[in-house]
Amino acid sequence: PMFIVNTNVPRASVPEGFLSELTQQLAQATGKPAQYIAVHVVPDQLMTFSGTNDPCALCSLHSIGKIGGAQNRNYSKLLCGLLSDRLHISPDRVYINYYDMNAANVGWNGSTFA
Amino acid sequence: PMFIVNTNVPRASVPEGFLSELTQQLAQATGKPAQYIAVHVVPDQLMTFSGTNDPCALCSLHSIGKIGGAQNRNYSKLLCGLLSDRLHISPDRVYINYYDMNAANVGWNGSTFA
Amino acid sequence: PMFIVNTNVPRASVPEGFLSELTQQLAQATGKPAQYIAVHVVPDQLMTFSGTNDPCALCSLHSIGKIGGAQNRNYSKLLCGLLSDRLHISPDRVYINYYDMNAANVGWNGSTFA
């Protein structure tokens, strides 16, 4: 799984250990070993949500399986909670796109997972 | 809806009010309230198009519905026009990927839109 | 086609001509003219893979067609090889998401490819 956060929150406001915490919590939530989890945080972005530049985040979670209605709601609760607790972003200023990737469409280690 | 522009145009060349204009124009084009529109502009990128580093842009528009053949052509006309007028990027050096997102695959406010 | 590389490798470690090489190699691999190929490299990113910040990359390749099981394996071999040779990123710390785009969902030059 790959989780990406783009946010207008400054780099200095991203706490030490935030990527580690995301990794651990995504491992718990997806049931995938932490060794397969990638996390990418992009602060200081030029972005608006609802036309204002208050703190906001545009995110994506790509996974081979483990994507679906109930699971995505659970991920949203988790991830919006972390973004609120750690980056002080209001959950109603967060979008998270979920992608259920086909194993044949994910490259790794010189091949794919298919 | 979420509109993202990645471009090699420098930050200084992004005019004041560009994100606001994108928000308003996308609200009008998609028929969605501006309060639900997120815009993200990423300047100063290391990118080439056709093998050259003349001004170019790689963009995406994610929306729950309002994506389709005729609509996408209209969005492309609008967005290429704005990128040309405001950032001086030639329309033939712009790609825009359109994504019709399932409501269950878009997280917001601690849950999803499903 | 559009190839994007996000990496925690620093800008200074991206060799001169890397984007040109990616363009040429992707043109050859996809059978698409170089004039249609866009490449975007984003260094210096705050990212982890397997919970560590050793060199890693999160990538995507979008194409109208030319995406599939065997082709993706070939692209992965090519691209992981280039990332290893040029940026010194271990192939088992690279993810590449492949997207087979519908022509109607790719905007260019004020319209779409449909």
């Epitope: 491992a27 718990q28 939530a29 070993p33 397969y36 081979i64 609760k77 280690n109 | - | -």
Partner: antibody
Amino acid sequence: QIQLVQSGPELKKPGETVKISCKASGYSFRNYGMNWVSQPPGKGLEWMGWINTYTGEPTYADDFKGRFAFSLDTSASTAYLTINNLKNEDTATYFCARSNYGNYFDYWGQGTTLTVSA
Amino acid sequence: NIVLTQSPASLALSLGQRATISCRTSESVDSYASSFMHWYQQKPGQSPKLLIYLASNLESGVPARFSGSGSRTDFTLTIDPVEADDAATYYCQQSNEDPRTFGGGTQLEIK
């Protein structure tokens, strides 16, 4: 060292409610999911579901939706299983088990034996 | 739901012999570069104990006599050589999809 310690055996009548506890120690409680597994006498293991220890969000297997509830007291590093409106067929040993990343169960409680009888 | 079928249901072996327990799944439990299949040992009156995780990884503290193999839908737990202390019931479990399901168990008796 890592331990999961469950509450003691329970004898209940049909229609009553039981609450079984599972106290964790030796690790960061909120970083690992907690599962509940049932084992009727002389039978095999059945996964009941799990609770996300960060969000408190429970997930139930189909056979355990309705009368069964998972909850947490994160300040006490404790997970709970509550069974309402007990039935004779709820007689079983209930285990809590920590899921490591990959959802294998690396640490188990000692089990709580529940007997439901009129 | 993914169904796990263990065989045999029981086996009796002499000390020093090799025990082979099979677990077949109704669909693949492979994802990413791993097989999400795990093996447990349970002795009477005790809680289960993790032996093997992700098909072939030996849990810390488990003797090297235990090994796991397989991928996709066919998995094997091997104990070689068996010892008296190995008398127990062995369960496979998949975690590729919820619900996380167990096999029916294999009872190993040491003659």
